[in-house]
Amino acid sequence: EEELQVIQPEKSVSVAAGDSATLNCTVSSLIPVGPIQWFRGAGPGRELIYNLKEGHFPRVTPVSDPTKRNNMDFSIRISNITPADAGTYYCVKFRKGSPDVELKSGAGTELSVRAKPSAPVVSGPAVRATAEHTVSFTCESHGFSPRDITLKWFKNGNELSDVQTNVDPAGKSVSYSIRSTARVVLTRRDVHSQVICEVAHVTLQGDPLRGTANLSEAIRVPPFLEVTQQSMRADNQVNVTCQVTKFYPQRLQLTWLENGNVSRTEMASALPENKDGTYNWTSWLLVNVSAHRDDVKLTCQVEHDGQPAVNKSFSVKVSAHPKEQGSNTAAENTGTNERNIY
């Protein structure tokens, strides 16, 4: 009598996540009578995958009708494969009894699952930083298999080198994750800059997946302040201008102080953008010189994006000869500054 053979013709099968996998198994003889069962793994910890007689296996269907007379094909199809389905599958013949006795196992078919990485997600720093400071961006992608993957960082199209990348886990796994951190030195011109994390994997049809982050979310460009006085008008009014330039983001509050007392507070809104993404803002204050006996100390105080206020101060000299007033005189552009205007 010829010995029963359980034939699993494929040593290995590879499928893409989401597809179906067919695991082939035929037997060489109809005797002895008894069921076929499919297991993943071998030994005492093996997992039952399919048993015609009992249980509910929603993703597993027989390829041919196992109830058909003289059926010797016990191949199965597993639908909607995920990386978690990877492993070695055994087709096992049992002899009918109480209980059934394991008779012979096929050689096993290793199921390998290829899975695409998820779209990379890039996250930036929690708080803004100014030019010349270094900020870190993180890129993460998950669920890919096999483990081999490349990740590159770019800033405005130029590849970044200050990068640290890890693929986890280090050992064998059904799927993997990648996490990478790039350190970027900010410049004042970076409001319109972008960092891109680019992930390439065998499962991607030629084009890497990309995640992006705008440096506008990470940068603060503090303003320059300049205070100037226009010519004295015929009605003894002096027009003083505070020019706030090259700042980002737009969140800015400007306060005028006359001799230390708040004269007016304004909030920047709906400002036109400069080419480099920064903003400029100009505020005017009319000072009636004839209403003052003594010099008037004017301060332009700017609070930008929740940072400590920056001041520019100067004095308007109340003169007996107002007509000799100079035109368009600027305050110095550093620190807190006082300037006599004659």
Partner: antibody, heavy 116, light 109 residues
């Protein structure tokens, strides 16, 4: 699923030549496609690929000698200034559904002879 | 660029023989290796991908093994239709480029 190359002919050195690969049974927007060549009596040589979105990538030796592009149903290989060394059978191929590391469907090839 | 060295460049064998062809990569390509069969005047046909996976419709007498830099194609029992030239092809996941071995011609002894 089928690939058919066309455009192979006898050409003059320095005169550009364009080969086409017409596909049927699948969408070019879903797969990487590649061009390969085989000089008479020699082995297979990789020229370049075009990604599903239309980005071309070339073998390091190409150096602008070839340009790969595609439309919805054809992929083209432009030979920019062919020399006699470019005489070969040119094949187009499609990568497998599991990944870009192998090519499972090939066209029959088209012969290009560059001669003065 | 990665170099693929195939050996032997040719071999003579008889029907029923077990035939082994090897391919060595100049650096690790993990398991990204495919084997093709080509007959004169025809396009290459995929036999094995990912080093050891048999492509659908390919007879089970063909098998592949190896990973890293050393790979093998085995024909367990050579059939008349197997006389052809065999090529290995690598894909490097970092450079994302392809390289072929120079080919092995299997001839009738």
């Amino acid at each position: 699923v089928q690939l058919v190359e066309s455009g192979g002919r006898l050409g003059q050195p320095g005169t550009s030549l364009t080969l086409s690969c017409t596909v049927s049974g699948f969408s070019l927007s879903s797969y990487v496609m590649g061009w390969f060549r085989q000089a008479p009596g020699k082995g297979l040589e990789y020229i370049g690929i075009i990604s599903s979105s239309g980005s071309p990538y070339y073998a390091s030796w190409v150096n602008g000698r070839f340009t790969i592009s595609k439309t919805s149903t054809t992929m083209d290989l432009k030979m920019n200034s062919p020399t006699t060394e470019d005489t070969a059978t040119y094949f187009c191929a499609r990568v497998g559904p599991l990944g870009v590391d192998y090519f499972n469907i090939w066209g029959p090839g088209t012969l290009v002879t560059v001669s003065s | 660029d990665i170099q693929m060295t195939q050996s032997p460049s040719s071999l003579s064998a008889s029907v029923g023989d077990r035939v082994t062809i090897t391919c060595r990569a100049s650096q690790s390509i993990n398991s990204y290796l495919a084997w093709y069969q080509q007959k004169p005047g025809k396009a290459p046909k995929l036999l094995i991908y990912s080093a050891s996976f048999l492509y659908s419709g390919v007879p089970s007498r063909f098998s592949g093994s190896g990973s890293g830099t050393d790979f093998t194609l085995t024909i367990s029992s050579l059939q008349p239709e197997d006389f052809a030239t065999y090529y290995c092809q690598s894909w490097h996941y970092i450079s994302r480029s392809y390289t072929f071995g120079q080919g092995t011609k299997v001839e009738i002894k």
